[in-house]
């Protein structure tokens, strides 16, 4: 039978940490984390790491018992915990059956946004007391709400993170730059700004019907290439929603026509 | 059943070089570490290094690292080194060799006699 | 790297003897040993992996011993095809190392 894994929390040392061990297994050849999403609930999701390893091809993993995995986190509260990965059968090859090196994976440890992460693993039995512990390590941070995993987290869907307003922008002259962008269901007030060094043109915007709105914003200079940050103001997020952003770009001959007045927006400039 | 087919022999110019082949049969190519092994004349048994040809990985003796090249061919289910910058000393019979389950060398080729000479 | 010490280096001995050819690893190789046979002009062959398992179509006056640093290989009541080249090899991490080789002749 082919070896898996059982996992569980080990929060102290390994047991066999305090035995004396004439060998031990290698090293890990290789370690990876990637992002997944766990329904919890009805409309409840989790952003867990998967974190996968692969084991170098020799005989030293004859010895192989388990593999531990540690992860720190690092932003406004430090986090540690680690989970010990139990081999439920010896290695009876160096590769797999199939072919290839022998890739294990576990799913766990929630995933807060925009944290960085350390994690750490090594093979059980590693090495004796004050002799080198070969592990391996990476360095993961985790992204921000735009990113197409953790925008499903709750914090970051009242933050608008399901929200696409396909913003499209265009200097229409010299002095003039349209806007166009789809509204949000869950609130009424944007602030549009195109900036490239420095402000180039501003707006802000009420509007309460659900649709496509486009906005002409006076600017003081070139604009083409200029970069367009649309912020909404939700009821969910209040001042803090994600910003999208967009570039303007030449308006070509057949871009919609600025929408009849009573659909156009210029306040503030 | 398993086979490794390696050519006889190979002349070669003193700092030429020459790639050998070892041509398999018989297994899942995939399945398997390939090894090399030198042994000069009159001489024992020197491991070259070894290639996974799942992922083509490979880890040398480091006395080769600079003499040897090794590569596979996944769809030919086919192994070859490529020995460069060939001097005298590099006269010997280069064989392949497949691993067991672990690296034991269950099957070997008929081995290649490389021959350095102006 | 690991340093496979073989002993003797050459052995002369008739049909029907007993012989033994020992294998010293610098290191504890944890039975990570196997043994090969090559007569002359040929590639070797695998005899016996980690320490005493036979390879196939192997006779079974061929035996294997050992654990940790020393090991052997006994071949009971030589047979005229017995005679050639021992190899002793251990392969607990790269780099994979050779012993030097005994040579069984016929007396």
């Known amino acids: 039978r082919e070896p898996t894994i059982q996992c569980g929390s080990e929060t102290g040392p390994s047991p066999e940490w305090m035995v004396q061990h004439t060998l031990t297994p290698g090293d890990l050849r290789d370690l990876q984390v990637e992002l997944v999403k766990t329904s919890v609930a009805a409309e409840e999701f989790s952003i867990l790491m998967n974190i996968s390893w692969i084991l170098r091809a020799d005989a030293s993993i004859r010895l192989l018992k388990a593999t531990k995995i540690c992860v720190s986190g690092k932003n406004n509260m430090n986090s540690y915990s680690c989970v010990r990965c139990n081999y439920t059968e010896a290695f009876q090859s160096q590769t797999r059956p199939s072919g290839g090196k022998w890739t294990f994976s576990y799913v766990g440890f929630p995933v807060e946004l925009s944290t960085l992460y350390l994690i750490s693993a090594h093979n059980i039995p590693n090495a004796n007391m004050n002799e080198d512990s070969p592990s391996l390590s990476v360095n993961f941070t985790s992204p921000g709400c735009l990113n197409h995993v953790m925008k499903y987290k709750k914090q970051c869907t009242e933050a608008g993170s399901l929200w696409d307003p396909d913003i499209t922008a265009c200097k229409k002259n010299e002095k003039m730059v349209e806007v166009n962008f789809t509204t949000n269901p869950l609130g009424n007030r944007y602030t549009i700004l195109i900036q490239r060094d420095t402000t180039l043109g501003f707006s802000r915007v009420l509007e309460n019907k659900l649709m496509r709105t486009s906005v002409a914003i006076p600017v003081t200079e070139e604009s083409e290439g200029a970069v367009v940050q649309l912020t909404p103001y939700l009821h969910t997020c209040g001042n803090d929603c994600i910003r999208r952003e967009g570039t303007v770009v030449l308006c070509s001959e057949t871009s919609a026509p600025i929408p009849p007045d009573d659909n156009r927006r210029m306040l503030g400039g | 059943q398993v086979q490794l087919q390696q050519p006889g022999a190979e002349l070669v110019r003193p700092g030429a070089s020459v790639k050998l082949s070892c041509k398999t049969s018989?297994?899942?190519?995939?399945?398997?570490?390939m090894n090399w092994v030198k042994q000069g004349p009159e001489q024992g048994l020197e491991w070259i290094g070894r290639i996974d040809p799942y992922d083509s990985e490979i880890q040398y003796n480091q006395k080769f690292k600079d003499k040897a090249i090794l590569t596979v061919d996944k769809s030919s289910s086919a192994a070859y080194m490529q020995l460069i910058s060939l001097t005298s000393e590099d006269s010997a019979v280069y064989y392949c060799?497949?691993?067991?389950?672990?690296?034991?060398?269950?099957?070997w080729g008929q081995g290649t006699l490389v021959t350095v000479s102006a | 790297d690991i340093q496979m010490t073989q002993s003797p280096a050459s052995l002369s001995v008739s049909v029907g003897e007993t012989v033994t050819i020992t294998c010293r690893a610098s290191e504890n190789i944890n039975s990570n040993l196997a043994w090969y046979q090559q007569k002359k002009g040929k590639s070797p062959q695998l005899l016996v992996y980690d320490v005493t398992n036979l390879a196939d179509g192997v006779p079974s006056r061929f035996s294997g011993s050992g654990s940790g640093t020393q090991y052997s290989l006994k071949i009971n009541s030589l047979q005229s095809e017995d005679f050639g080249s021992y190899y002793c090899?251990?392969?607990?991490?790269?780099?994979?190392?050779f012993g030097g080789g005994t040579n069984l002749e016929i007396k």
């Open positions: 018989g297994y899942t190519f995939i399945s398997y570490w």
């Open positions: 090899q251990h392969f607990w991490r790269p780099p994979y190392t």
């Open positions: 060799a497949r691993s067991g389950g672990f690296d034991w060398f269950a099957y």
